[in-house]
């Protein structure tokens, strides 16, 4: 059920999940100098049913030096709404998956969390791509990738997006980099089923992406 590989890499593009399918896990990791509280959670889990899903567990970090200080931030509903709005500013914004049944929205930050987030995506997860600042999109199809299960193996579909520099002339079809088919890698190249994957993101903001839907940069 969990996806094995990272979503495909597109040159000069980043991807973002608008919402996370039930079953998705997020590691509770702390930044240098901090550690999980005693008996703290190892990960958060998007749990629930088709009508309502939410993140189970809270990630809590405490100073490695001070044993008893614990700090954890859980935004109030208003703050969550505000954060969500910030993520939804792009004119190319896809459907708000956070309102879809069986999905969780981006988990709120916790104090002293690690600079990288590790997600474990599940089959059916969709991620959206957008060109980084200074590059524009040449679309040949959906700028998204979905984790699918075929013949007992997980794979990500290939997003149909090319990012070209603002000053560059558009590439002619014959000059385009070869792209995998929308259905992803050929079956012969698809690795055997693995049931878990951790995905890394950096929680540091990208410099200035005025129309960006991304509050986090995925690697």
């Amino acid at each position: 059920e969990l996806c094995d590989d990272d979503p495909p890499e597109i040159p000069h593009a980043t991807f973002k999940a608008m919402a996370y399918k039930e079953g998705t896990m997020l590691n509770c990791e702390c930044k240098r100098g901090f550690r999980r509280i005693k008996s703290g959670s190892l990960y958060m889990l998007c749990t629930g049913n088709s009508s309502h899903s939410s993140w189970d567990n809270q990630c809590q970090c405490t100073s490695s030096a001070t044993r008893n200080t614990t700090k954890q931030v859980t935004p109030q509903p208003e703050e969550q709404k505000e954060r969500k709005t910030t993520e939804m500013q792009s004119p190319m914004q896809p459907v708000d998956q956070a309102s879809l049944p069986g999905h969780c929205r981006e988990p709120p930050p916790w104090e002293n969390e690690a600079t990288e987030r590790i997600y474990h995506f599940v089959v059916g997860q969709m991620v959206y791509y957008q060109c980084v600042q200074g590059y524009r999109a040449l679309h040949r199809g959906p700028a998204e990738s979905v984790c699918k299960m075929t013949h007992g193996k997980t794979r990500w579909t290939q997003p149909q997006l090319i990012c070209t520099g603002e000053m560059e002339t558009s590439q002619f079809p014959g000059e385009e980099k070869p792209q995998a088919s929308p259905e992803g890698r050929p079956e012969s190249e698809t690795s055997c089923l693995v049931t878990t994957t951790d995905f890394q993101i950096q929680t540091e903001m990208a410099a200035t992406m005025e129309t960006s839907i991304f509050t986090t940069e995925y690697q």
Partner: antibody
């Protein structure tokens, strides 16, 4: 096919250190956390700690914090666990296991501490 | 730390039997319960995670249930290859802890 390969056995003297390996194949090493588990004969499984190979982030069971050092070499897709100041209590089978669910396990390394 | 107790350390059953192995946690573990099978040669495999989710490749005769502090693993139709020791483990509260194991034998 996911595989975690561990040496079958390691022999060490009391007071010495031992460093055992766990070579991963069949998946991208940096996309999953690697955990280490201790099992004494006829006993249960004791979680030692884990490492996130991508970032080097580690988390230890307090019981093993001063005894154990976890590292990972991305270039060879290998995780390592070093045990220091060995005593007879450290004689056990040590397993590496992938991900929080421990979905795939190595065959285990039997560590014997003996003079 | 959370204590996990498997009150039955060994269990005898006949091939074809329905076998249930129980596990109790010292506090509510909110379904973060995994089951592992350890063969006599030491090989360990994940069977069930998050109380009832069957790991890939595990036969459907294995199932898990429970909530709060009490959990169980059921083998609906015991086969020779199921002879092993079964461990429960709470998998989300630091540190993860396991029961002492239940050794399953053939009558």
């Amino acid at each position: 096919q996911v595989q975690l390969q561990q040496p079958a056995a390691e022999l060490a003297r009391p007071g010495a250190s031992v460093k055992m390996s766990c070579k991963a194949s069949g998946y991208t090493f940096t996309t999953s956390t690697m955990h280490w588990v201790k099992q004494r004969p006829g006993q249960g499984l004791e979680w030692i700690g884990y490492i996130n190979p991508r970032s080097g982030y580690t988390e230890y069971n307090q019981k093993f914090k001063d005894k154990t050092t976890l590292t990972a070499d991305k270039s060879s897709s290998t995780a390592y666990m070093q045990l220091s100041s060995l005593t007879s209590e450290d004689s056990a089978v040590y397993y590496c296991a992938r991900h929080y669910y421990f979905d795939y396990w190595g065959q285990g390394t039997t560590v014997t501490v003996s003079s | 730390d959370i204590q996990m107790t498997q009150s039955t350390s060994s269990l005898s059953a006949s091939l074809g039997d329905r076998v249930t192995i129980s596990c109790r946690a010292s506090q509510d573990i909110r379904n973060y319960l995994n089951w592992y099978q350890q063969k006599p040669d030491g090989t360990v495999k994940l069977l069930i995670y998050y109380t009832s989710r069957l790991h890939s490749g595990v036969p459907s005769r294995f199932s898990g249930s429970g909530s709060g502090t009490d959990y169980s693993l059921t083998i609906s139709n015991l086969e020779q290859e199921d002879i092993a020791t079964y461990f429960c483990q709470q998998g989300n509260t630091l540190p993860p802890t396991s029961g002492g194991g239940t050794k399953l034998e053939i009558k």
